[in-house]
């Protein structure tokens, strides 16, 4: 008789999740020699230990502490790029601007990017059928708690000028309920961070509005200012040209506003 299994509203664990985490760990430590001391099998064991045999609606940041410890990594604190709802462009940017880092350019972010995972209470099985949805089921699920934990730590590590890429095509350019709005903004350390600079990325080719005047950006400015951190904002009217100019800053067309 098959065991009764909880049906959650979200997609199940990514197929070959353990193998993917291990392969990514091997790749990351190959590309980043400063992380070659990392034991990928121990990393996987710690990752697994955070959610296996635990109720997937009862995961805590504490569950991820062994993994956080193994994945401890120093990134230049003044070269951090946060993003909200515009991951692909942020990643394209750091692939070109190699001295800047998104969370997914760190080991732990790289391991988990785009993956889903959860277990079942009291069994050592990974649930490949379904996992809790943040809205429909519970917020303290393995994936959400992981990203909350690593995002908090990443924001806490930032210093000097912190950049954030925001999606100007969305109705809420700054969304208080996003990871950036609910976690990272509140964990920037005012004693270390001087300025948060927002880059608002325009979607339409003919969109010449100043999206830095958007009410949600003003809301972000208010939150940041109240935390004694300066705020600045720039419109990126042409993201394609923006990337091209990051690649080739000497290009004559890159002197004008992009």
């Amino acid at each position: 008789v098959p065991r009764w299994r909880q049906q959650w509203s979200g997609p199940g664990t990514t197929k070959r999740f353990p193998e993917t985490v291990l392969a990514r760990c091997v790749k990351y430590t190959e590309i980043h020699p400063e992380m070659r001391h990392v034991d990928c099998q121990s990393v996987w064991d710690a990752f697994k230990g955070a959610f296996i045999s635990k109720h997937p609606c009862n995961i805590t940041e504490e569950d991820y502490q062994p993994l956080m410890k193994l994945g401890t990594q120093t990134v230049p604190c003044n070269k951090i790029l946060l993003w909200s709802r515009i991951k692909d462009l942020a990643h394209q940017f750091t692939q070109v601007q190699r001295d800047m880092f998104t969370l997914e350019d760190t080991l732990l972010g790289y391991l988990a990017d785009d993956l889903t995972w959860c277990g079942e209470f009291n069994t050592s099985k990974i649930n490949y059928q379904s996992c809790p949805d943040w809205r429909k089921d519970c917020s303290n699920n393995p994936v959400s708690v992981f990203w909350k934990t690593v995002s908090r730590r990443f924001a806490e590590a930032a210093c000097d000028v912190v950049h954030v890429m925001l999606n100007g095509s969305r109705s809420k350019i700054f969304d208080k309920n996003s990871t950036f709005g609910s976690v990272e903004v509140h964990n920037l350390q005012p004693e270390k961070v001087q300025t948060l600079e927002a880059w608002v990325i325009h979607g339409g080719r003919e969109d010449s509005r100043d999206l830095c005047q958007d009410p949600t950006i003003k809301e972000l400015e208010s939150i940041i200012s109240k935390r004694n951190i300066q705020f600045s904002c720039k419109n990126i009217y042409r993201p394609d040209k923006f990337l091209q100019c990051v690649k080739n800053p000497e290009d004559s067309s890159c002197t004008s506003e992009i």
């Epitope: 197929k15 070959r16 193998e19 993917t20 392969a23 091997v26 430590t29 190959e30 034991d39």
Partner: antibody, heavy 125, light 113 residues
Framework: QVQLQESGPGLVKPSQTLSLTCTVS??????????WSWIRQHPGKGLEWIGY???????YYNPSLKSRVTISVDTSKNQFSLKLSSVTAADTAVYYC?????????????????WGKGTTVTVSS | DIVMTQSPDSLAVSLGERATINCKSS????????????LAWYQQKPGQPPKLLIY???TRESGVPDRFSGSGSGTDFTLTISSLQAEDVAVYYC?????????FGGGTKVEIK
């Protein structure tokens, strides 16, 4: 083409550490896209996978043997090695080194396409 | 770990006749993302190391005679030797590489009747 050759003592005393080396010729151990593996075969029995190492040093061991296994790599000598501690008679086997295919983009572990000839290790006092 | 079960344990076939070996995995080794079965077949002759015959369940390794073929998907796989030759006398193993650790079947001994 790539060839693998195991070497090491054929007799090990119980409780001691078994040490074997695999020398790779005809290709560089440092070229990505491969995992370097150890497999053993007990007398008259099937095959048991022990573990792998990537040229960068990343390892993965069979959980059933993990507490006793260490695999290391020496890229300058084009060799990788196996150490198995606290051996008993149950560790008597033919030990093979092998190359497992992978991908360069994301190195998943695949099938083993090149094998060494194997070396017999007997655990006895 | 994924358990690989082979049948039969041994098989006696006349020269020129067909030999069929079965392999069953305790869970599917088909990866839906790329529609590939993570299964390999090896041949081991006495006193020799295993030799890769088939990978991705049905792709023949370079230099392997076309009388060897692999089929199946999910959990059930077959290695077929269409016309048995004297040099095919060996033990044949299936192996999954869908999940770590890789695991092997117990082997099937093929002899000449």
């Amino acid at each position: 083409q790539v060839q693998l050759q195991e070497s090491g003592p054929g007799l090990v005393k119980p409780s001691q550490t078994l040490s074997l080396t695999c020398t790779v010729s005809g290709g560089s151990i440092s070229s990505g896209g491969y995992y370097w593996s150890w497999i053993r075969q007990h007398p008259g029995k099937g095959l048991e996978w022990i573990g792998y190492i990537y040229y960068s040093g990343s390892t993965y061991y069979n959980p059933s043997l993990k507490s006793r296994v260490t695999i290391s790599v020496d890229t300058s000598k084009n060799q990788f090695s196996l150490k198995l501690s606290s051996v008993t008679a149950a560790d008597t086997a033919v030990y093979y080194c092998a190359r497992a295919k992978s991908e360069l983009v994301l190195p998943y572990y695949y099938y083993m396409d090149v094998w060494g000839k194997g070396t017999t290790v007997t655990v006895s006092s | 770990d994924i358990v690989m079960t082979q049948s039969p344990d041994s098989l006696a076939v006349s020269l020129g006749e067909r030999a069929t070996i079965n392999c069953k995995s305790s869970q599917s080794v088909l990866f839906s993302s790329n529609n590939k079965n993570y299964l390999a077949w090896y041949q081991q002759k006495p006193g020799q190391p295993p030799k890769l015959l088939i990978y991705w369940a049905s792709t023949r390794e370079s230099g392997v005679p076309d009388r060897f073929s692999g089929s199946g998907s999910g959990t059930d796989f077959t290695l077929t030797i269409s016309s048995l030759q004297a040099e095919d006398v060996a033990v044949y193993y299936c192996q999954q590489y869908y999940s770590l650790p890789p695991t092997f079947g117990g082997g099937t001994k093929v002899e000449i009747k």
